[in-house]
């Protein structure tokens, strides 16, 4: 069985302010079990954008129905984009752990650039 990989096919995405950004991510396997999370930035100061497991993320919707048992598409949409949303977004697979899940694999990242609204 091949080891799970996290694929972010888009190196960069350009979105106009006020529009919706789609950030694509797929996993190549369902195993090991564990949640997907999206972050902006890397390292200890990274910002959690979406957690499959829990939390309230009103600007974020998933492209696919994550309640499908065979789902491997973890792409997200972020609504009402502003220049403050610019940055590199990482799709990260965690494997279950106790007491905390353990980071397992990260995608290569997608850089989101925001085009200002014409005045």
């Amino acid at each position: 069985e091949e080891e799970l990989q996290v694929i972010q096919p888009d190196k960069s995405v350009l979105v106009a302010a006020g529009e919706t950004a789609t950030l694509r991510c797929t996993a190549t396997s369902l195993i090991p079990v564990g949640p997907i999370q999206w972050f902006r930035g890397a390292g200890p100061g990274r910002e959690l954008i979406y957690n499959q497991k829990e939390g309230h993320f009103p600007r974020v919707t998933t492209v696919s129905d994550l309640t499908k048992r065979n789902n491997m598409d973890f792409s997200i949409r972020i609504g009402n984009i502003t220049p403050a949303d610019a940055g590199t977004y990482y799709c990260v697979k965690f494997r279950k752990g106790s007491p905390d899940d353990v980071e397992f694999k990260s995608g290569a990242g997608t850089e989101l650039s925001v085009r200002a609204k014409p005045s």
């Epitope: 195993i31 079990v33 494997r95 106790s98």
Partner: antibody, heavy 118, light 108 residues
Framework: DVQLVESGGGVVRPGESLRLSCAAS????????MSWVRQAPGKGLEWLAG????????YYIDSVKGRFTISRDNPKNSLYLQMSSLTAEDTAVYYC???????????WGLGTLVTVSS | SYELTQPPSVSVSPGQTARITCSGG??????YAWYQQKPGQAPVTVIH???KRPSDIPERFSGSSSGTTVTLTISGVQAEDEADYYC???????????FGGGTKLTVL
């Protein structure tokens, strides 16, 4: 408060069909996968079927594939289990259960009793 | 598929610690939960995701996992904890839910 209320149970003869319903309230039904679990008298729990939040994907234990059909009506906040070709072995209390993000169960209904007897 | 095995019965005195084990499944592909069922009642989830306790469940209930064995621990057992306890698993390889045979906890 999350509430799941099953209905539709009763006494049927072998070979007959029955449709169970589960009315959900207290949460956004269309956001959660759901399952049916049964318990024969004096026996343990047995998972039967699950359905994704949108209703497009269904999953069954081998022993009921082809005889049972799980479905849902999100606007009506309702889950269903259509059962056909019933036998005495299907006699049980049938529970609907809400799934967690990882397909375990966090809330259960009170159950509805199905008795298959000639 | 896989089977989950748990002891048929466990007895403990009030105030003591009860441990119920469940073995089977594969750690990397299976999530586990524990369900409490009292006579004539519906099951209640006391632990999910191996070790996560719902907010309305007393802190004396805890879950842990080691390899292919998961354990439900009830610290300071009370008379009201007497019930059947089922371990349940979800297998990400097969998309199937499975239950153990149940353990009857008797509070002496």
């Amino acid at each position: 408060d999350v509430q799941l209320v099953e209905s539709g149970g009763g006494v049927v003869r072998p070979g007959e069909s029955l449709r169970l319903s589960c009315a959900a309230s207290g949460f956004t039904f269309s956001s959660y996968a759901m399952s049916w679990v049964r318990q024969a008298p004096g026996k343990g729990l047995e998972w039967l079927a699950g359905i994704s939040a949108g209703g497009s994907d269904t999953y069954y234990i081998d022993s009921v594939k082809g005889r049972f059909t799980i479905s849902r009506d999100n606007p009506k906040n309702s889950l269903y289990l259509q059962m056909s070709s019933l036998t005495a072995e299907d006699t049980a209390v049938y529970y609907c259960a809400r799934e967690t993000w990882n397909h375990l169960f966090d809330y259960w209904g009170l159950g509805t009793l199905v008795t298959v007897s000639s | 598929s896989y089977e989950l095995t748990q002891p048929p019965s466990v007895s403990v005195s009030p105030g003591q610690t009860a441990r119920i084990t469940c073995s089977g499944g594969d750690y990397y592909s299976t999530y586990y939960a524990w369900y409490q069922q009292k006579p004539g009642q519906a099951p209640v989830t006391v632990i999910h995701s191996d070790d996560k306790r719902p907010s309305d469940i007393p802190e004396r209930f805890s879950g842990s996992s080691s390899g292919t064995t998961v354990t439900l621990t009830i610290s300071g057992v009370q008379a009201e904890d007497e019930a059947d306890y089922y371990c349940g698993g979800y297998d990400g390889r097969t998309y199937i839910n499975t239950f153990g045979g149940g353990t009857k906890l008797t509070v002496l």
